[in-house]
């Protein structure tokens, strides 16, 4: 969490941002809140990016002002206009690109004063893994697949019964570049699987950590998966 305060002149206002991560090829949100004002027409929101000449986005007098917007953000940004009055200056970013990573500044002017806060935005790719029994294999085998990751993640297998066991010798992981030549499909195969056990396929890079669990018994197969973003810090 980054909390910024205004500078001299008018009173300072508190602006708060949260470091976050964007998933390439999806929409993202850059979070920013501020001390609200009574009149929407008195609020100015400017989003800037370090190293970029034009503005990322500007909102003033109750509407978007696009004349100074930088080419790289063309048609890809919007604030939540109906929430500005309650102090939400968060930016919605469409079709996140790898190049969107960097340091952003959320700069606010209201009738109460000015304030700003920086935000670190990471970009990469992360997706939920799916673990299945590979019936085509000669022995009992599990196959863990996740369609989109970047940077290249690590893949680790674990089991409930054999806690602490190292499965690297009985697993094989491959990374296949996707068609846009940035993200990769992750496929990991675990051999010599025993029945009545829960196995976990854990995929992790510096942006996200995802786990796919599978429980195989005589009568049924149960699956569960979850994904968690790393390093979300508020400022």
């Amino acid at each position: 969490l980054i909390i910024g305060f205004g500078i001299s002149g008018r009173h300072s206002i508190t602006v708060t941002t949260v470091a976050s991560a964007g998933n390439i090829g999806e929409d993202g949100i850059l979070s920013c809140t501020f001390e609200p004002d009574i009149k929407l027409s008195d609020i100015v929101i400017q989003w800037l990016k370090e190293g970029v000449l034009g503005l990322v986005h500007e909102f003033k007098e109750g509407k978007d002002e696009l004349s100074e917007q930088d080419e790289m953000f063309r048609g890809r940004t919007a604030v939540f206009a109906d929430q500005v009055i309650v102090g939400n200056a968060s930016l919605r970013l469409k079709n996140v690109q790898l190049t969107d990573a960097g340091t952003y500044k959320c700069y606010i002017i209201t009738s109460k004063g000015k304030g700003n806060a920086n935000l670190e935005y990471k970009t990469g790719a992360f997706s939920m893994p799916e673990v299945n029994v590979d019936y085509n294999a000669s022995s009992e085998t599990l196959r863990c697949e996740a369609p989109r990751w970047f940077p290249q993640p690590t893949v680790v297998w674990a089991s409930q019964v054999d806690q602490g066991a190292n499965f690297s010798e009985v697993s094989n992981t491959s990374f296949e570049l996707n068609s846009e030549n940035v993200t990769m499909k992750v496929v990991s195969v675990l051999y010599n699987v025993t029945i009545n056990n829960t196995y976990s396929c854990m995929i992790e890079n510096d942006i996200a950590k995802a786990t796919g669990d599978i429980k195989v018994t005589e009568s049924e197969i149960k699956r569960r998966s979850h994904l968690q973003l790393l390093n979300s810090k508020a400022s």
Epitope: N23, G25, E26, D27, K63, D64, E65, L66, S67, Q69, R74, G75, R76, A78, R92, K94, N95, A125, S127, P147, R148, N178, S179, E180
Partner: antibody, heavy 120, light 107 residues
């Protein structure tokens, strides 16, 4: 050659449901945002919804929010529109459209459309 | 929501004449405006992107201009195949609104 072929339209009663499909070919489907745009008889174009290239992000027009669901299956190169709680005013030709790759928000390729009629 | 208003609703001209179609936005959208042509029974076709940028395969007689709130599509010398409905589209926000259309008909 880029091709978008819609299917699944038909006659449905008010309150009913329908699922439209759009089969894409001739381009790398998984790289593009996709949208549905509709056109009521004798009327203009109305954007309905978009889905991101990976399928994880969606956005809807206010007129269909909460009733329609856009989705995609990149393995099958297919875009979907699940329509429920249909109303007479949803009667239209539904087009699937590809958003431009570099900077979105305009549609460089369109399908020929599939007709949805909501009537009792 | 950004509202686009096109004028005139109908434009009656003869082949060889110059056509000027207007599109006005309810608030400034810089140059984030696109133009489409639609013929009866067909899907729309992209003509101009970002107010004035030409599209590959579209004849040079089609041109666009404008910025902010006022935009113009010009067809320098009408061909018989140009008689159709023309739509402008807001390319700025996440809700991608269209104008109501201008019908270009043969006089």
């Amino acid at each position: 050659e880029v091709q978008l072929v819609e299917s699944g339209g038909g006659l449905v009663q008010p309150g009913g449901s329908l699922r439209l499909s759009c089969a894409a070919s001739g381009f790398t489907f998984s790289n593009y945002y996709m949208s549905w745009v509709r056109q009521a008889p004798g009327k203009g174009l109305e954007w309905v919804a978009y889905v991101s290239s990976g399928g994880g992000s969606t956005y809807y027009s206010d007129s269909v929010k909460g009733r329609f669901t856009i989705s995609r299956d990149n393995a099958k190169n297919t875009l979907y529109l699940q329509m429920s709680s249909l109303r007479a005013e949803d009667t239209a030709v539904y087009y699937c459209a590809r958003e431009s790759y570099s900077q979105g928000n305009y549609f460089d390729y369109w399908g020929q459309g599939t007709t949805v009629t909501v009537s009792s | 929501e950004i509202v686009l208003t096109q004028s005139p609703a109908t434009l009656s001209l003869s082949p060889g004449e110059r056509a000027t179609l207007s599109c006005r936005a309810s608030q400034s959208i810089s140059d984030y405006l696109h133009w489409y042509q639609q013929k009866p029974g067909q899907a729309p076709r992209l003509l101009i992107k970002f107010a004035s940028q030409s599209i590959s395969g579209i004849p040079a007689r089609f041109s666009g201009s404008g910025s902010g709130t006022d935009f113009t599509l010009t067809i320098s010398s009408l061909e018989p195949e140009d008689f159709a409905v023309y739509y402008c589209q807001n390319g700025h926000s996440f809700s991608l609104t269209f104008g109501q259309g201008t019908k270009l008909e043969i006089k």
